[in-house]
Every structure is written in C-alpha cells, then in structure tokens.
Interface confidence: medium
Amino acid sequence: QCKILRCNAEYVSSTLSLRGGGSSGALRGGGGGGRGGGVGSGGLCRALRSYALCTRRTARTCRGDLAFHSAVHGIEDLMIQHNCSRQGPTAPPPPRGPALPGAGSGLPAPDPCDYEGRFSRLHGRPPGFLHCASFGDPHVRSFHHHFHTCRVQGAWPLLDNDFLFVQATSSPMALGANATATRKLTIIFKNMQECIDQKVYQAEVDNLPVAFEDGSINGGDRPGGSSLSIQTANPGNHVEIQAAYIGTTIIIRQTAGQLSFSIKVAEDVAMAFSAEQDLQLCVGGCPPSQRLSRSERNRRGAITIDTARRLCKEGLPVEDAYFHSCVFDVLISGDPNFTVAAQAALEDARAFLPDLEKLHLFPSD
C-alpha cells in the first residue's frame, strides 16, 4: 500500500520542530523555506533528504498516486531552491504525537481529493484542462486538437495513464463498410490513496448503467469517496461521471446505435503516463494507418450528399470538422439520426474546452 501520507506527515513534523512548532500547511514547500525563516538550510535539507528517501521506499506501491507525484516534484523543487546536496545526513524520524492543528482558516483543511481546489491554492489559478472526444464513425478529437476519422476495429485505448484507462470497442457500422462505430466503452478509475477504490464503468449500446460495475455510484468508503460520482439527467441516453479527485468530467452518450465519449481532464492528469503507454487516441489521435479520409465514404441508402449537408446544417451551421463528420456519418450510415452525435459532441466541446477559439476545427482534407 502507498505510504505517501506517512512520508508527508513525517516531513511536516520534522520541519515544524525546526521552526519551533509553527503552523501546519500543505506539504509542498512545507519548511517555509530555508535561510532566515527559522529553519536553517542544513536542517531543512536533512528533512528533505529524509522525505526523498521515504518516497523512494514507497515508490513501487505509489504509481499513479497524485499525492505521491506531487510530493516527488515538490521535494525536487525545494532541494534546488535551498541548494541541498542529494547525499548527506537525514533527519531522525519524528516522535509520534497528537495530530497538529490546522491554521484555523475557516475553510476545511486542504482536501487531497479536490484536485482543482488544491491546485488553485498553490498556483493562484485554476488548473489547465484538456478535452478529448470520440463519436460517430468514430471521429476522434484529441487533446491537441487533431481531428481524425478512424477505421479502428476491436478494442482501442482512448486514454491509458496513471489515473484513468478508457477503452472503446468498435465494430463495422454495416457489413463491408470501412467505417466503424463504438459499441462498448470501458473506463477504469484507478485506486487512489484516501480518495477512491478502483472503480470500473462499462457501457454498451442499449445499456448505459448509472452505476459502476460493483453497483456503487461513488468512489467507495474511503474519506474522499464522494470525489467520484456518477449521475444522469437522461437515463438510457446520457451518463456523466465526475472525478473531482483528478479534476475530470466524463460524458457518455448513446445516439443512433453508437456510443460517444467526451472528457474534460486536468492537464497534469492527462499527461501522467509512461513511454509504454504511448498508444492513446486522445493523445496522438488515430494512428496514420487507421485514418479514413472524408473522400473514402461509401454512401449507403437513399441519402444524397446535398440532403446530408442540409440535415447537418440545421444543427451545425458552421462548416467545421463537426459538420463534415456529421455529413460523413449520415452518408455512410444512411441514418439521419447521426446528426445528433456530432451536435452533442460540439455541445460537449463548448462546455469542456478551456479555449473556445479552438471550438471549431477545420480539417485540411
């Protein structure tokens, strides 16, 4: 089990004793910093080296723990800030004692399961967010504003990082068609220290549960269990999952017999992955070999291109990537209901994108 909280507590205790029992605060930067502040840089460096040692000992069990990664980066920053050498004496473990009082701020103690609140407090601004979506045939809008139509069949990861795993399973829209549609979505919210137990959400066409696989609707019995929740205003067609502990909102919709996925996620969370987790459609878009050009559409049914354009124009007046995706979907499926998927994806992007100037993407092909 990840012991980062014990490392944090020991570091705070050792720096408090150096400061003569000052007030507590968040761990990052916790000594109040060095020369002239009551904490001699020698004492602080000893405490930081102990903290680093403690994090190294628990590293194996802390992969994907936000508090752990935050602590590691914080230690690094502080050691540089205070010119601490990596080698040298460490602080003795602090005596066990009663819990320390907070600073009496009138606000609750920093909530480790409120990513946005924690980030804002330290950085003086809200965190940066990224948006990714998959809908229709499927069309994927990546975090970096690439917009691809994919021919992917079978299971493909949209996201695969230290906190989240999202997999879409696609199958051909019609016999012999190049285009595919998402029929199943699997989302794994990875276990996170005091916030949530691991939770799995699975949706299939005609089965959008408003609960995780274990029947629960939150993150479990841990102190921060409520920082993961699942809800709907439109049962059977729409599910929203809020994961406040990682600054994330996910929307899953069912339209025209296919599933759409949309996410707004904190930048740091989205980018917390290693080299071996490199295949993620939300990060790199569709692999080049799996991309479909809009010219590759095989029209099915009685819908002409003019009719498709007219149908799509009603809800998507701007001829952007969403509009062109809509035309593609309507033509290839022969189903006018496919207009809804692109419209909903655009609405999600409007709600989720931090920069609305990037709302309308204009594909080059």
Epitope: S23, G25, A26, G30, A103, S120, H123, G124, P126
Partner: antibody, heavy 117, light 110 residues
Amino acid sequence: EVQLVESGGGLVQPGGSLRLSCAASGFTSSSYAMTWVRQAPGKGLEWVSGISGSGESTYYADSVKGRFTISRDNSKNTLYLQMNSLRVEDTAIYYCARQGYGAHDYWGQGTLVTVSS
Amino acid sequence: QSVLTQPPSASGTPGQRVTISCSGASSNVGSNRVNWYQQFPGMAPKLLIYSNNQRPSGVPDRFSGSKSGTSASLAISGLQSEDEADYYCAAWDDSLNGYVFGTGTKVTVL
C-alpha cells in the same frame, strides 16, 4: 492565527515608485498563492496581481502590466508589490490576500497609496 | 472596469429573502468557481462563499450561493440589520488570465 499586515503605502507623485510589503504569519507561506487587490476611494474591488506558492508563476491585471511587479520571499514570509510609473488612477487601498481553495480566504487591513501632484 | 455585472443595490426588510445576481461569461463564471465577499464600510473584505456554494466556518447558513451557466447568485434569507454591507462576486477569467470582481451590490436593510 492567520495574519496579513500590509505596509509601504503613502503619498507619491505621478511617475514615482513605491514598494508595498505584506508580512504573513500563522501559516506556511510557500503553500499558498498570494494576491494583491485594490480599491479606489468609493469604488469596487479590483484584482491587481497574483503569485504562486513557489513564486514561479505571476499574473497581472492589464491595467498594471509592465509597471507593477509582484514577488515573494518565503523565507521571510513576505509578499511584495513593486509599483513603478504610478498614475493618479492607481490611488487606492491595496490589500494583500491569501489564496485558499481558489478564493481569497484571508485579507490584510490594507495600505493606502495616494498618487497626486 | 469590472467584467462581472451585479445590480448596484438590493434591499429588504428584516426577515426577508434578498438575492444578488452576478452575470459573467463562459471564460469566467461559465468555466470557473465563483466566490462571494462581504465588505463593511472602512473594513477589509471577508470571504462569504467559495466554490459557488461553500460556506467557510463561521458564516451563518442564511447565506447561500449557486451557479448556473454564466450566472451566479447569492441569497440572504432571513435578512438581518448586520447584513447591511457591500457584496462582491469574483471568479478567475481564463481569457484575461486573472481574477475578476463584480461591480458590487450595496445591501440595505429597511
């Protein structure tokens, strides 16, 4: 107990400079972003500048960009606002505030800056 | 110039409910948390509501906040004479990369 005490205000001529300080106590300074907010006589609140807990990130209102500089010394638990090229419209009470939970949860009592010829 | 718009004044008799609106845009209220501050004449502002609807300890539960889309509101139920003050909303603005305050509302208890 959390306390913020501003100092350094006073009367200055247009084009002149002032340096405001805010001494913080009762909390670990480096764990909180800090901001300066001002209030012109009889007017509303205006956010001036903010700085992250480490001091690495700084933010400014357009009205003061290029003239004011925010900084902090966490070893002294002190926040600063260096104000150059002061204008008559910079006349205000300047408050320093601690940022907790994305809000300004503690405020100092303010220091008056008067820019007049 | 304030980016968030509030009515200049609001009033009510003791015991009444008063609501103050705060209208913004997608770059501030629409995408970030809204905070409310109370300021008595000659005093520093005090945090009243944070994160749209959270009350710091010590703030009476007759104060409540809410947010919908690009608008937020502060409600004072059971108005008391000591609630006579100026009230400001505020939020981070993604476009300006800074905080923005509302124009302020003076609440008078009749």
